[in-house]
Interface confidence: medium
């Protein structure tokens, strides 16, 4: 079932510059992507950009540059000239239309820890919330255990002291695990029927849907415009990650399709998935 992720990032160098990253985890072929702010387009939101796989992109101020990052993800750079930086508290929504079955829209905003009003640059680690106390507790136990092991190893003078240096990839994955549930639990409060699935694949986005465009009919199988940047894990340091449920091009948004309120942090990241016949393409 299609998944959409949205991540909003504030540029470290310019506190007034923001980038919205959105991705579609398939299956199906993307027909149109709409990015809006202030809510979903058509439900109080304002359209910022529209990206079409064949016809290119169009954008409206304050959008600076909209482009395809991969065959299934886009980025939108925003220029915030105002001193008060209104983007800090704004919701951004991305809608991926996959005709004729519908569209999938998710919304996200800049995490509180990225408030441009802070005098110091925001910390790259999102604030962990109360609903993650269990994870924190477990982490604490593990850290204590590691510390104790280090203590024991130091006492063995005939052995060198190991230097524990967690990899960047692992810290990103931890960030994702910690951040996603808090967003999901908030969304669940707002929509009692929402089945939240804050899933993402820790590998590149291309592994989720590497041949999406090839599944289009030949007359629509052009590569997306813009340079296809390598798709790293779709969780960036100061980003928010929200996956809401499916909407039709409803400009309706939300997310997904499981029958119960599931929370999947690392779902089955299958490779290419065949586009179902229901799409009725030639």
């Amino acid at each position: 079932t299609p998944e959409v992720w949205v991540q909003v990032q504030m540029e470290a160098t310019e506190l007034s510059s923001f980038t919205v990253h959105c991705g579609f985890l398939g299956p199906g072929s993307i027909s149109l992507v709409t990015v809006s702010w202030g809510g979903p387009d058509g439900a109080g939101g304002t359209k910022l950009a529209v990206l079409h796989p064949e016809l290119g992109t169009r954008q409206w101020a304050p959008a600076r540059q909209a482009r395809w990052e991969t065959q299934s993800s886009i980025s939108l750079a925003l220029e915030d000239s105002g001193a008060s930086s209104p983007f800090a508290n704004t919701t951004f929504c991305c809608k991926f239309a996959s005709f004729p079955e519908g569209s999938w829209e998710s919304c996200g905003s800049l995490p509180p820890s990225s408030d441009p009003g802070l005098s110091a640059p925001p910390t790259p680690v999102p604030i962990l919330r109360a609903d993650l106390a269990g994870i924190l507790g477990l982490s604490g136990v593990l850290l204590f255990g590691c510390g104790y092991l280090l203590h024991l190893l130091r006492r063995q003078k005939h052995r060198p002291t190991p230097r524990l240096q967690p990899s960047h990839t692992n810290s990103q994955a931890l960030t994702a695990q910690a951040w996603a549930p808090s967003q999901a639990s908030q969304a669940a409060l707002h929509d009692p029927y929402a089945t939240i699935n804050t899933s993402f694949c820790p590998a590149t986005l291309d592994t989720a849907h590497p041949n999406g465009w090839a599944s289009l009919p030949t007359h629509a199988a052009h590569q997306p415009q813009g340079p296809a940047a390598s798709a790293s894990t779709p969780i960036l340091a100061r980003g928010s990650f929200v996956s809401v449920e499916n909407g039709l091009y409803t400009q309706a948004g939300e997310r997904p399709p499981h029958t119960g309120p599931g929370l999947t942090l690392f779902p089955d990241c299958r490779g290419p998935r065949a586009v179902e016949g229901r799409f009725g393409v030639r």
């Epitope: 079932t1 027909s31 149109l32 979903p40 387009d41 058509g42 439900a43 359209k47 529209v50 079409h52 064949e54 016809l55 239309a97 005709f99 004729p100 079955e101 519908g102 569209s103 829209e105 707002h190 929509d191 029927y193 929402a194 089945t195 007359h219 629509a220 809401v244 449920e245 499916n246 909407g247 039709l248 091009y249 409803t250 400009q251 309706a252 948004g253 939300e254 997310r255 997904p256 399709p257 029958t259």
Partner: antibody, heavy 115, light 107 residues
Framework: EVQLVESGGGLVKPGGSLRLSCAAS????????ISWVRQAPGKGLEWVSE????????YYPDTVTGRFTISRDNAKNTLYLQMSSLRAEDTAVYYC????????WGQGTLVTVSS | DIQMTQSPSSLSASVGDRVTITCKAS??????VAWYQQKPGKAPKLLIY???YRFTGVPSRFSGSGSGTDFTLTISSLQPEDFATYYC?????????FGGGTKVEIK
């Protein structure tokens, strides 16, 4: 097989209220946004409202905003349209339709607003 | 709101004829246009979506083209079961809007 079955239509006086239902089967209801589309006798199609798959987002044209409310119960696989302050011009066959655009339609239910 | 202007409002044709119906959007909708067929007393049926993609089970004699503001539905060889009313619809933005319809009648 995808099936959408509308019910709840009937005769109502101007200013009155009515609630339409749309029972869905043959697909994962909670995965799809659904719309109501109406057709006045001898006229064309008019989109009336949409609701996202979880019910969070709803959409209406100006003609019905404030009078119609779309909702859904995913546990019951049912879509609703609560209509109030009905007018003669609301007389139409009301269809529920799935997808975007509307790939699957119900058979429709007739709503007649007349004194 | 995006207005969809469909023409002609009606036409008479014979079995085997090539029929063309046009739809003009009041603003650019890229390729987000669908076409429906409706017979008296029945619900509409989706024929074409995203300008040129045939929906599941739709015969190949139906085709769509266009982009931006001008769109066309073509029936390459009209069959007896094709006599009906056809509607275009933009699925680019809310509110959804339909064309006024084109009634295809037997000559």
């Amino acid at each position: 097989e995808v099936q959408l079955v509308e019910s709840g239509g009937g005769l109502v006086k101007p200013g009155g209220s009515l609630r339409l239902s749309c029972a869905a089967s043959g697909f994962t209801f909670s995965s799809y946004g659904i719309s109501w589309v109406r057709q006045a006798p001898g006229k064309g199609l008019e989109w009336v409202s949409e609701i996202s798959s979880g019910g969070t987002y709803t959409y209406y044209p100006d003609t019905v905003t404030g009078r119609f409310t779309i909702s859904r119960d995913n546990a019951k696989n049912t879509l609703y349209l609560q209509m109030s302050s009905l007018r003669a011009e609301d007389t139409a066959v009301y269809y529920c339709a799935r997808g975007d655009p509307f790939g699957y339609w119900g058979q429709g239910t007739l709503v007649t607003v007349s004194s | 709101d995006i207005q969809m202007t469909q023409s002609p409002s009606s036409l008479s044709a014979s079995v085997g004829d090539r029929v063309t119906i046009t739809c003009k959007a009041s603003q650019d909708v890229m390729t987000a246009v669908a076409w429906y067929q409706q017979k008296p007393g029945k619900a509409p049926k989706l024929l074409i979506y995203s300008t040129s993609y045939r929906f599941t089970g739709v015969p190949s004699r139906f085709s769509g083209s266009g982009s931006g503001t001008d769109f066309t539905l073509t029936i390459s060889s009209l069959q007896p079961e094709d006599f009906a009313t056809y509607y275009c619809q933009q699925h680019y933005s809310t509110p959804r809007t339909f064309g006024g319809g084109t009634k295809v009648e037997i000559k």
